[in-house]
């Protein structure tokens, strides 16, 4: 025998209290598939979240973050403070990248500049807080008098945590 609930479309639920009639989802709830015995409660976007997409009877609300914050996790499960390019978020707030490191985004941690000399190449463009070093040809490939000195990128200080 076919389950009468399987006929209930998305946006409704199979109401056991009413002889398994398909009832519309109550306000602030939704069902995204047919045959549901309950509707799910809509996600609320509070605090530093803002509503990207309103909840409907067939789909959940979607949140993103208010300006100055960016999403983390699947479905924007949390917001994190933006920093400027050339900075990283530490437990004391946004801090400039240390010498020898860069961050070209508003999120994430500062990364060490590419060490061109490790690949036997010269530095074409020096690294900055906001951008990586750009490597050029190896010094041997350069014409006489056009050699470039590549200081090694300093390592992070021991114990430095990128949090």
């Amino acid at each position: 025998l076919q389950d009468p609930c399987s006929n209930c479309p998305a946006g409704t639920f199979c109401d056991n209290n009413r002889n398994q009639i398909c009832s519309p989802c109550p306000p602030n709830s939704f069902s995204s598939a047919g045959g549901q015995r309950t509707c799910d409660i809509c996600r609320q976007c509070k605090g530093v979240f803002r509503t990207r997409k309103e909840c409907s009877s067939t789909s959940n609300a979607e949140c993103d973050c208010t300006p100055g914050f960016h999403c983390l996790g699947a479905g924007c499960s949390m917001c994190e403070q933006d920093c400027k390019q050339g900075q990283e978020l530490t437990k004391q707030g946004c801090k400039d990248c240390r010498f020898g490191t860069f961050n070209d985004q508003k999120r994430g941690i500062c990364q060490p500049w590419t060490n061109c000399s490790l690949d036997g190449k010269s530095v074409l463009v020096n690294g900055t807080k906001e951008s990586d070093a750009v490597c050029g040809p190896s010094p041997a490939d350069l014409s006489p008098g056009a050699s470039s000195v590549t200081p090694p990128a300093p390592a992070r200080e021991p114990g430095h945590s990128p949090q």
Partner: antibody
Framework: QVQLVQSGAEVKKPGSSVKVSCKAS????????ISWVRQAPGQGLEWMGG????????NYAQKFQGRVTITADESTSTAYMELSSLRSEDTAVYYC????????????WGQGTLVTVSS | DIELTQPPSVSVAPGQTARISCSGD??????ASWYQQKPGQAPVLVIY???NRPSGIPERFSGSNSGNTATLTISGTQAEDEADYYC??????????FGGGTKLTVL
């Protein structure tokens, strides 16, 4: 079935440090925020700080800033809480707790680790 | 930081309705969760995002949050509900605050 298993009880001297571990099993480790919450004897719950392992992002309650460090090792699905410059008032049960993905509730808790600070 | 204030204790007769309040500036603008803790045990989430009940939590537990106050309501209170209850708030970032806790006594 998600489980958070914490390291065993510790007895520490004032001024020293303690590092408590919290190993997660039965779920995705790197996308869920792990928080550390402590409870002194007969007192309430106190949020210390948390980390989202997959993002390397940590944050701390103002009261503990500079004294607590929370880290995570994705390869072993383990979070750590290190508290330094211990004093007798730090005697407490320390819990790790996992936040639900999209909402604000801590749906899974470790069994707790008693840290006793005594000279 | 938002500060959350709870009454230290609430008493209720079996079968009656217990209400535990949690107040803080503009608390209704943030998410509120509630935890039950029995002696010697880890806390258990009973309400999240103001009014949602995790699976396995009895229907007699409900929550609301507006203005400056979040409320945990236990209707038809049972002896097994005697415990400490903590509210907690979340603003969407990696930052959480707990209230001081309320001891619920079932008379």
């Amino acid at each position: 079935q998600v489980q958070l298993v914490q390291s065993g009880a510790e007895v520490k001297k004032p001024g020293s440090s303690v590092k408590v571990s919290c190993k997660a099993s039965g779920g995705t480790f790197n996308s869920y925020a792990i928080s550390w919450v402590r409870q002194a004897p007969g007192q309430g719950l106190e949020w210390m700080g948390g980390i989202i392992p997959g993002f390397g992002t940590a944050n701390y309650a103002q009261k503990f800033q500079g004294r607590v460090t929370i880290t995570a090792d994705e390869s072993t699905s383990t979070a750590y809480m290190e508290l330094s410059s211990l004093r007798s008032e730090d005697t407490a049960v320390y819990y790790c707790a996992r936040k639900n993905e999209e909402d604000g509730g801590f749906d899974h808790w470790g069994q707790g680790t008693l840290v006793t600070v005594s000279s | 930081d938002i500060e959350l204030t709870q009454p230290p204790s609430v008493s209720v007769a079996p079968g009656q309705t217990a209400r535990i309040s949690c107040s803080g500036d503009n608390l209704g603008d943030y998410y509120a969760s509630w935890y039950q803790q029995k002696p010697g045990q880890a806390p258990v989430l009973v309400i999240y995002d103001d009014s949602n009940r995790p699976s396995g939590i009895p229907e007699r537990f409900s929550g609301s949050n507006s203005g400056n106050t979040a409320t945990l309501t236990i209707s038809g209170t049972q002896a097994e509900d005697e415990a400490d209850y903590y509210c907690q708030t979340w603003d969407g970032t990696l930052h959480f605050v707990f209230g001081g806790g309320t001891k619920l006594t079932v008379l």
